[in-house]
């Protein structure tokens, strides 16, 4: 069936054209030559001007920007939403870690307390920092906690005779933690543990940002005036010769959007990897990979580093009499 | 003997964690993640089309507009932009990304490698010499409750078990913050916990 | 007991590097780690960078691109480095040990400082 | 940066006398851990800065109970209950809960 004849006085166009800028100054009363169109270039006489065609681009491209988003819409909320529960959730693990480990000292060590509160509350602040991004190094987190440590086993428990706040032995103590292996390889397990558990979840947790800002910026990508040109011409152009109800044809839309999506859809060969890459991390995530899994195990190893150096408590006091010597006379004095 | 944590722990020598069937954890909730991003792996080259569907297009129509005249849906005219001389879409398609994707697919780039380097390889998570340093006793088997880092006198195992969605909302706490005391039980070997919810400093 | 002592160049000119050691006694740097901050008339105490005792370092934003800190943990012995440096940088420059957790901690003891002057 | 202010600049008092010295952070100094970590110093003529107070109100070793700190978020004070000849000189406070550390300008505690 043939198109029904442009309207001869473009009355059909007007309301039309009304919906998208109230005020009819820009909408011909009969159809005219056109010739300064540059879009919607005529056949014919034209109910479309110039304010009109520009009207008609800046519309398709609010239209284009707006599918855009709503094409996003589930999938940016399925990655925010999963980016806030695993951060909270991680939080809580490390929570639970830190209260697992500080029940540990007050049960099994209550004479390590308060000291020993500080020192754990220090390091989990650290592996909080650490998920979330901070440039704080696992080894030091770690060798802290045990150089902190140490001086307290040694003043309250291996040798409580010592007079309180020995302050010279205890730079001596430091020291002698690493020098002398005092905890056995237990702190070495730990940084091998915690540091590659706490990599992957933090990367894990980076990703997922990435993710979100991925699809941010293809959710508010402006579109160029040529990809305008090509939306106005294949939503509006017909709206100039009176063919209102006519719809683009289904190839031609492909053609268009592949045009104005050109550099967007470079994105979807990364966009696979990144999908790809972040299951084949997951996958990984158990065992020492997982922080959950090392976090609040962690007590019990402490507890065992502890228990190691009780068993060489003898062995240790004497070399340690020896070792700090110096320091222990000054203190007596 | 040693005090542990909550009731996570009956004796040291089994020292398992009650496993309720169905309870989610974190890493069951990191594989459903996956599991729902993987529908949208197509996601970027799929758009052109999404886009169209859910704008106006003819379907049921004999007609439809071309850019430049009312044709028949079949024909070859419809799938063919008629002004060819406006300006070619060849161009626009040369013309690369707006820096912007640009910049976010140097970005993808380097989280997909820092994605491949962290990415354990198959077979080589259990390393003897890292998972098991200094662990004197006990076999941990694939199907097993996790094992971590212990000592001689019996595995510590632990059922790696977070409620996670229920701890989400009402969340255990042992800080030393007003209003969370702890009792050390020492007839039952445990510690009770009065719970707060909400995030404590 | 535990000491820091500086030793370096009092007059260091633009085209030069300005570099400092601190000796330390009384510790261990395989236990402790060891803090820059610098004092002049227009800006005050400034703290320029720590190392730690595994030998990693955190350096003031400001200033990351000019500075370098190392150790030599056998001489107990901290190196401080700072490139290109202007007349503004003229400061006394102190070391100091760190107490406390980190980068959450304090200087507990000071180094004597050295002062620098940049002159042309 | 966090930007740190101390009042008074100068600070005249009589040996016995009590002093306090106010320093405010532009940021709060509360860390999400709980703690809160703001340190004084005092630098004695032509010396090097000598640590006194550190978390707010713990005395460093070998620091009279004179001294005493107080305080928290962004505003914090630190006493002197009877003023000693050996305490003049310029006292700073300091923070270190938010990276890079920074000091106050200093109070000069000088007789009067």
């Known amino acids: 069936q043939p198109p029904p004849p442009p309207d001869a006085t473009c009355h059909q166009v007007r309301s039309f054209f009304q919906r998208l800028q109230p005020g009819l100054k820009w909408v011909p009363e009969t159809p005219v030559p056109g010739s300064d169109l540059q879009v919607c270039l005529p056949k014919g006489p034209t109910c479309c001007s110039r304010k009109m065609e520009e009207k008609y681009q800046l519309t398709a491209r609010l239209n284009m920007e707006q599918l855009l988003q709503s094409a996003s819409m589930e999938l940016k909320f399925l990655i925010i939403q999963n980016a806030a529960v695993f951060q909270e959730a991680f939080e809580i693990v490390v929570r639970h870690a830190k209260n697992y480990t500080n029940a540990m000292f007050k049960n099994n060590y209550p004479s390590l307390t308060p000291q020993a509160f500080e020192f754990v509350g220090e390091f989990f602040t650290d592996v909080s920092l650490y998920i979330l991004g901070s440039d704080i190094n696992v080894d030091d987190m770690v060798n802290e906690l045990f150089d902190s440590l140490f001086p307290v086993i040694y003043t309250q428990m291996m040798n409580p005779g010592l007079p309180e706040s020995v302050l010279d032995i205890n730079e001596c103590l430091r020291g002698a933690r690493r020098d002398l292996k005092v905890f056995g390889s237990f702190p070495k397990l730990i940084m091998t543990q915690v540091s590659k558990s706490l990599q992957v979840t933090r990367i894990f947790l980076q990703a997922l940002n990435l993710g979100i800002e991925v699809i941010n910026t293809t959710d508010h990508l402006k579109f160029s005036k040529d990809c305008g040109r090509m939306l106005t011409r294949m939503w509006y152009c017909s709206y100039c010769q009176g063919l209102m109800m006519v719809k683009p044809c289904g190839g031609y839309c492909n053609v268009v959007m592949q045009g104005c999506m050109a550099g967007v859809v470079e994105i979807d060969k990364y966009w696979r990897e990144y999908i790809l890459s972040l299951e084949e991390l997951v996958n990984g995530m158990y065992r020492i990979y997982d922080m959950e899994n090392v976090l609040l195990g962690l007590f019990s190893t402490i507890h065992d580093s502890i228990q190691y150096v009780q068993k060489n408590g003898g062995k240790l006091t004497t070399t340690i009499g020896k070792l700090c010597a110096h320091s222990q006379q000054r203190q007596y004095r | 003997s040693a005090y542990y944590p909550e009731d996570l722990f009956i004796d040291k020598k089994i020292l398992k964690v009650a496993h309720v069937e169905h309870e989610e954890t974190l890493s069951s909730r990191r594989r459903e993640l996956i599991q729902k991003l993987k529908s949208f792996i197509n996601f970027y080259s799929a758009l052109p089309g999404y886009i169209c569907s859910h704008s106006p297009v003819a379907e049921n129509d004999t007609l439809c507009w071309n850019g430049q005249e009312l044709v028949e849906r079949y024909s070859q005219k419809a799938a063919r932009n008629g002004m060819k001389n406006q300006f070619n879409l060849h161009e626009l398609k040369m013309k690369g990304p707006e820096p912007v994707v640009s910049q976010i697919i140097d970005k993808l780039k380097h989280i997909n490698q820092l994605l491949r380097t962290m990415s354990v390889p198959k077979g080589k998570v259990l390393d003897k010499s890292l998972d098991e340093e200094g662990l004197e006793s006990g076999d941990c088997g694939d199907d097993e409750d996790e094992c971590i880092g212990s000592s001689g006198d019996g595995m510590v195992k632990v059922k790696n078990q977070l409620r996670f969605l229920a701890e989400l909302a009402y969340d255990l706490d042992v800080d030393d913050a007003p209003g969370n005391k702890q009792h050390g039980n020492q007839k039952d070997n445990e510690i009770t916990t009065s719970h707060s919810v909400g995030n404590m400093p | 007991q535990v000491q820091l002592k500086q030793s370096g160049p009092g007059l260091v000119q633009p085209s030069q590097s300005l570099s400092i050691t601190c000796t330390v006694s009384?510790?261990?740097?395989?236990?402790?780690?060891v803090h820059w901050v610098r004092q002049s008339p227009g800006k005050g105490l400034e703290w320029l960078g720590v190392?730690?005792?595994?030998?990693?370092?955190d350096y003031n934003a400001v200033l990351i691109s000019r500075l370098s800190i190392k150790k030599d943990d056998s001489k107990s012995q901290v190196f401080f480095k700072m490139n290109s440096p202007q007349v503004d940088d003229s400061a006394i420059y102190y070391c100091?040990?760190?107490?406390?957790?980190?980068?959450?901690?304090?200087?507990?003891?000071w180094g004597q400082g050295t002062s620098v002057t940049v002159s042309s | 940066d966090v930007v740190m202010t101390q009042t008074p600049l100068s600070l005249p008092v009589s040996l016995g006398d009590q002093a306090s010295i106010s320093c405010r952070s532009s940021?709060?100094?509360?860390?999400?851990?709980?703690?809160?970590?703001l340190h004084w110093y005092l630098q004695r003529s032509g010396q090097s800065p000598n640590l006194l107070i550190y978390?707010?109100?713990n005395r460093f070793s070998g620091v009279p109970d004179r001294f005493s700190g107080g305080g928290s978020g962004t505003d914090f004070t630190l006493k002197i209950s009877r003023v000693e000849a050996e305490d003049l000189g310029i006292y700073f406070c300091?923070?270190?809960?938010?990276?890079?550390?920074?000091f106050g300008g200093g109070t000069k505690l000088e007789i009067k």
């Open positions: 100091g040990r760190n107490g406390g957790w980190l980068l959450r901690g304090f200087m507990d003891f």
């Open positions: 009384g510790f261990s740097l395989t236990s402790y780690g």
């Open positions: 190392i730690w005792s595994s030998g990693n370092t």
């Open positions: 940021q709060s100094l509360l860390h999400s851990n709980g703690n809160t970590y």
């Open positions: 978390k707010v109100s």
């Open positions: 300091s923070q270190s809960t938010h990276v890079p550390w920074t």
